[in-house]
């Protein structure tokens, strides 16, 4: 379950089953959300383009202690080929825009659903 960044990148990308599992997990998060997700933590917005998985992980990895997104962090880590640590930032972040984790998850989910519908997973 590794890739060289995002769907627009050359090389291996997550197969359809892995993408479907990530989508299902994000759906689960949005549907089961009661209190503010991750206590309303804010994360950097990202460009949903090439290198999306690593950029998403770089953003979400700065959220600690949020059990709701632990599995998502694990999955994104599996999709990103390089080591990502908290406090690490790439040019893929929209560095002047922070959004709530809940909104980040919704945006990511919408984008992944679109890619899945278009068959962009192999």
């Amino acid at each position: 379950l590794t890739c060289l960044g995002g769907f627009a990148s050359p090389g291996p990308v997550p197969p359809s089953t892995a993408l479907r599992e990530l989508i299902e997990e994000l759906v689960n998060i949005t549907q089961n959300q009661k209190a503010p997700l991750c206590n309303g933590s804010m994360v950097w917005s990202i460009n949903l383009t090439a290198g999306m998985y690593c950029a998403a992980l770089e953003s979400l990895i700065n959220v600690s202690g949020c059990s709701a997104i632990e599995k998502t962090q694990r999955m994104l880590s599996g999709f990103c080929p390089h080591k990502v640590s908290a406090g690490q930032f790439s040019s893929l972040h929209v560095r002047d825009t922070k959004i709530e984790v809940a909104q980040f998850v919704k945006d990511l989910l919408l984008h992944l659903k679109k890619l899945f519908r278009e068959g962009q997973f192999n």
Partner: antibody, heavy 118, light 111 residues
């Protein structure tokens, strides 16, 4: 800087309950997970349970019926309560904070020693 | 529950030599391409200290003499070369599944 400090009764009579407080500083409990780990004298480490920043609580299934973990984020305190103590519960009890993903236990308190004896 | 079995229970290594500690899990601790196995060092009278996370990543501030390897069920902690200050008990720990579990520990003595 990150600090954790456990405080407990020291001595507990058999069949009684144990209450330990972990008071933290240098970070917020709303965005951090706190674990409870114990270590009997001369023995290894045993994970008791944890409370996530968002409130979820996970317990060691073997001890779940005797354990209760809670917190008061506004006071920066995490609480461990254990019922029906016996001699083999004698141990040093640690609280430890997870780091960021992948949630290994990065920061530890010095621990508090608990002896179960009449 | 995932049971972690460490070997040997104790070992004595000469100063400057290599120490190798093993940890075997009763089932895989891998998830999405990562191994959720961590290593700690505990010196006498002190709390444990994280050395290695995700099987092979060195925690900040830990000397490069420490290294970790392995995947799925078999993991290794290596100290090379061993220094006098390394005398301690070392524990592996998994958090791939709840409950989190520790290995029984390996006591390292420096000769």
């Amino acid at each position: 800087q990150v600090q954790l400090k456990e405080s407990g009764p020291g001595l507990v009579a058999p069949s009684q309950s144990l209450s330990i407080t972990c008071t933290v500083s240098g970070f917020s409990l709303t965005g951090s997970s706190i674990n409870w780990v114990r270590q009997p004298p001369g023995k290894g480490l045993e994970w008791l349970g944890m409370i996530w920043g968002d409130g979820r609580i996970d317990y060691n299934s073997v001890l779940k019926s005797r354990l209760s973990i809670s917190k008061d984020s506004s006071k920066s305190q995490v609480f461990l309560k254990m019922n029906s103590l016996q001699a083999d519960d004698t141990a040093r009890y640690y609280c430890a904070r997870d780091g960021y993903y992948p949630y290994a236990m990065v920061y530890w308190g010095q621990g508090t020693s608990v002896t179960v004896s009449s | 529950n995932i049971v972690l079995t460490q070997s040997p229970a104790s070992l004595a290594v000469s100063l400057g030599q290599r120490a190798t500690i093993f940890c075997r899990a009763s089932e895989s601790v891998d998830s999405y391409g990562n191994s959720f196995m961590h290593w700690y060092q505990q010196k006498s009278g002190q709390p444990p200290k994280l050395l290695i996370y995700l099987a092979s990543n060195l925690e900040s501030g830990v000397p490069a003499r420490f290294s970790g390897s392995g995947s799925r069920t078999d993991f290794t902690l290596t100290i090379d070369p061993v220094e006098a200050d390394d005398a301690a008990t070392f524990y592996c720990q998994q958090n791939n599944e709840n409950p989190r579990t520790f290995g029984g520990g390996t006591k390292l003595e420096i000769k």
